[in-house]
Interface confidence: low
């Protein structure tokens, strides 16, 4: 195949670290309109496995604010509005990409990091272990 | 607040695009061990609002594979194992960062993109609108 000339606007890749270090444009292309999970829905209150949203803030990370869900109860809310301990409220987790400043306090140098966050809670049937 | 002096080992930031374009080290620091949501738990099957996981694949994006949750039912599973339509299964959504190569044909230049993914489902009490 023909080698297409590299776009002349490309960052220099003759670096000894290439391709371990890349340039990332932070002008985020946002395909969504609603960014605040507290405003996006009231599911956290209406769920049979309700949760609270805790603000996790870290200025050395991008995004600096991440909302973490914590289930309110061990059990789930039944039709009477009481906690039913025959069911379990459990967090639904998601692995996300974040950027961490590295070295620390450098405004334009980051490392990719994967972290696990709890997004909300769901009500599950418990796994019952029967003792013989 | 106190301004922390810039680390002298920081990369040069006198770029005309600074701080929109940053350097990112690709040696990902992964704080998690389990990356496949299908293996991480069986909540998607045990939930009262069960869901299926669909593979969303895009070779031009990092990560190229994202798992999307689709609720199996409009209602929720009751104690008898039947679908109760007095309750609603709804997706819990999370905004995540992904990387997309930009401009095209640059091997080491990317743009951050935010996308909304459904991580799992939860069972909620429906909002009932009473007609006067």
């Amino acid at each position: 195949g023909i080698t297409i000339p590299r776009n002349p606007g490309c960052p220099n890749s003759e670096d000894k670290n290439f391709p371990r270090t890349v340039m990332v444009n932070l002008n985020i292309h946002n395909r969504n309109t609603n960014t605040n999970p507290k405003r996006s829905s009231d599911y956290y209150n209406r769920s049979t496995s309700p949760w609270n949203l805790h603000r996790n803030e870290d200025p050395e990370r991008y995004p600096s604010v991440i909302w973490e869900a914590k289930c309110r109860h061990l059990g789930c809310i039944n039709a009477d509005g009481n906690v039913d301990y025959h069911m379990n409220s459990v967090p639904i987790q998601q692995e996300i990409l974040v950027l961490r400043r590295e070295p620390p306090h450098c405004p334009n140098s980051f490392r990719l990091e994967k972290i696990l966050v709890s997004v909300g809670c769901t009500c599950v049937t418990p796994i019952v272990h029967h003792v013989a | 607040g106190i301004t922390i002096p810039r680390n002298p080992g920081c990369p040069n930031s006198e770029d005309k695009n600074f701080p929109r374009t940053v350097m990112v080290n690709l040696n990902i620091h992964n704080r998690n061990t389990n990356t496949n949501p299908k293996r991480s738990s069986d909540y998607y099957n045990r939930s009262t609002s069960p869901w299926n996981l669909h593979r969303n694949e895009d070779p031009e994006r990092y990560p190229s594979v994202i798992w999307e949750a689709k609720c199996r039912h409009l209602g929720c599973i009751n104690a008898d194992g039947n679908v109760d339509y007095h309750m609603n299964s709804v997706p819990i959504q999370q905004e995540i960062l992904v990387l997309r190569r930009e401009p095209p044909h640059c091997p080491n230049s990317f743009r951050l993109e935010k996308i909304l993914v459904s991580v799992g489902c939860t069972c909620v009490t429906p909002i009932v609108h009473h007609v006067a």
Partner: nanobody, 119 residues
Framework: EVQLVESGGGLVQPGGSLRLSCAAS????????MYWVRQAPGKGLEWVAE????????YYVGGVKGRFTISRDNAKNSLYLQMNSLRAEDTAVYYC????????????WGQGTLVTVSS
């Protein structure tokens, strides 16, 4: 099941040539960029070359530019690396990899083929 099988390695004198091949199966080969990566004895992995889905765009690490050519045949689900003007420092196990758009992020690897450049 994804499989990548490399072949074509061997012993060659400095200045000589070799052509490595990689047979891919278990995924839609034409939908992915493909890579050659190498590991010299006692060293870490080094990304060597990348080729886009349709074969039209190739990227090379500085040290091999002008000497190595990456190519692919989507009809045969095959990836190739033509290596000319070989040097002692090219001695390594060469791996074919399917992966992400981020360099060095490969979700599947072959078993590798050893290339030894020595007189």
């Amino acid at each position: 099941e994804v499989q990548l099988v490399e072949s074509g390695g061997g012993l060659v004198q400095p200045g000589g040539s070799l052509r490595l091949s990689c047979a891919a199966s278990g995924f839609t080969f034409s939908s992915y960029s493909m890579y050659w990566v190498r590991q010299a004895p006692g060293k870490g992995l080094e990304w060597v070359a990348e080729i886009k889905q349709d074969g039209s765009v190739q990227y090379y690490v500085g040290g091999v530019k002008g000497r190595f050519t990456i190519s692919r045949d989507n009809a045969k689900n095959s990836l190739y690396l033509q290596m000319n003007s070989l040097r002692a420092e090219d001695t390594a196990v060469y791996y074919c990899a399917k992966g992400e758009i981020l360099p060095l992020y490969f979700d599947y690897w072959g078993q590798g083929t050893l290339v030894t450049v020595s007189s």
